[in-house]
Interface confidence: low
């Protein structure tokens, strides 16, 4: 009686079980009663990552530099190429098909978490006592200058965008 299901790494065709091609190889011809499955290795720019009966290998992913991509890991006959983003850019999606520039934190905001190849800059508002007067993808909020430690007094209050202005103490006349 012909089989209705085949073992692992086999497939059913013409009422018989044939061996699948191993990762890195494609199917050339199915097995017959007298011959084994015929497989061929994928070419240099192609891959297949599973036991398969594919007649064509998949093309390696192209890391398009015009989209800000570069090769993180070169593909093999059994694995696809892995792309990542150039310095200063991060992936737009889980599949990293294109990249976008890291955003800068505007004045009044500092960098909470520096961007990586897969995540954007995280900004946070500068709390009281801190400021940022630049638009930057790297700078954290900086603390206001301590006038007292310089034996000076605050002449102009700081904001989330500006440092305090220190000045000399008013000397009392005798």
């Amino acid at each position: 009686e012909p089989p209705t299901a085949c073992r692992e790494k086999q497939y059913l065709i013409n009422s018989q079980c044939c061996s699948l091609c191993q990762p890195g190889q494609k199917l050339v011809s199915d097995c017959t009663e007298f011959t084994e499955t015929e497989c061929l290795p994928c070419s240099e720019s192609e891959f297949l990552d599973t036991w398969n009966r594919e007649t064509r290998c998949h093309q390696h992913k192209y890391c398009d530099p015009n989209l800000g991509l570069r090769v993180q890991q070169k593909g093999t006959s059994e694995t696809d190429t892995i792309c990542t983003c150039e310095e200063g850019l991060h992936c737009m999606s889980e599949s990293c098909e294109s990249c976008v520039p890291h955003r800068s934190c505007l004045p009044g905001f500092g960098v909470k978490q520096i961007a990586t190849g897969v995540s954007d800059t995280i900004c946070e508002p500068c709390p009281v006592g801190f400021f940022s007067n630049v638009s930057s993808a790297f700078e954290k909020c900086r603390p206001w200058t301590s006038c007292e430690t310089k034996d000076l007094v605050v002449q102009q209050a700081g904001t989330n965008k500006t440092d305090v202005v220190c000045g000399p103490q008013d000397r009392q006349r005798a």
Epitope: I82, C91, M92, S93, E94, S95, V100, T116, S119
Partner: antibody, heavy 126, light 112 residues
Framework: QVQLVESGGGVVQPGRSLRLSCAAS????????MHWVRQAPGKGLEWVAV????????YHADSVKGRFTISRDNSKNALYLQMNSLRVEDTAVYYC???????????????????WGQGTTVTVSS | DIVLTQSPLSLPVTPGEPASISCRSS???????????LDWYLQKPGQSPQLLIY???NRASGVPDRFSGSGSGTDFTLKISRLEAEDVGVYYC?????????FGQGTKVEIK
Amino acid sequence: QVQLVESGGGVVQPGRSLRLSCAASGFTFSSYGMHWVRQAPGKGLEWVAVISKDGGNKYHADSVKGRFTISRDNSKNALYLQMNSLRVEDTAVYYCVRRGHQLVLGYYYYNGLDVWGQGTTVTVSS
Amino acid sequence: DIVLTQSPLSLPVTPGEPASISCRSSQSLLYSNGYNFLDWYLQKPGQSPQLLIYLGSNRASGVPDRFSGSGSGTDFTLKISRLEAEDVGVYYCMQALQTPRTFGQGTKVEIK
């Protein structure tokens, strides 16, 4: 509000069939992949099946393959689980679950199984 | 299939005290895009499971900040900074990298 409501559970003899339904409301059903997850009495969670948002891709756990079929009708905002050749070990609470995602810059990001129904109980007993 | 192993399986905790649950995977859950495809779910007594953490460390909407997820690759941890009475139940980790999805055995957290 976002809601999933299962129905169709009950007591059935081994070898018989049952069809579970899940009614979705409060969200665009056709935009989400959906899962069935089950929990046998006093046991942990076991994944059963998943179906893509358009119904084109379906996967079933080995323990139910060939016996259970997941399907959906987007025009009715409904998810189904057709259960044939039921066994005693299929006794469980069956949950309908949404595969969450968030849309960022035109791309979908996985967001966990973010909405669960209240569950429907299937008891297979002779 | 990917196997997830949780420890401990039972965790008695005094209210206000921290709690920590480990989840170990039989293979890496770190995808090439840098995300760890591991979620944490809580099933309170008599209720359906609810999502706590997705992609290893992202808190789901409405989840209190006393819950945090960490780890990468094969080793993950769920931490509760200060346990509250409403946090009791069974905690499950689940891998979302491959089909079939698989869950850990569950960790029962109860009040000491």
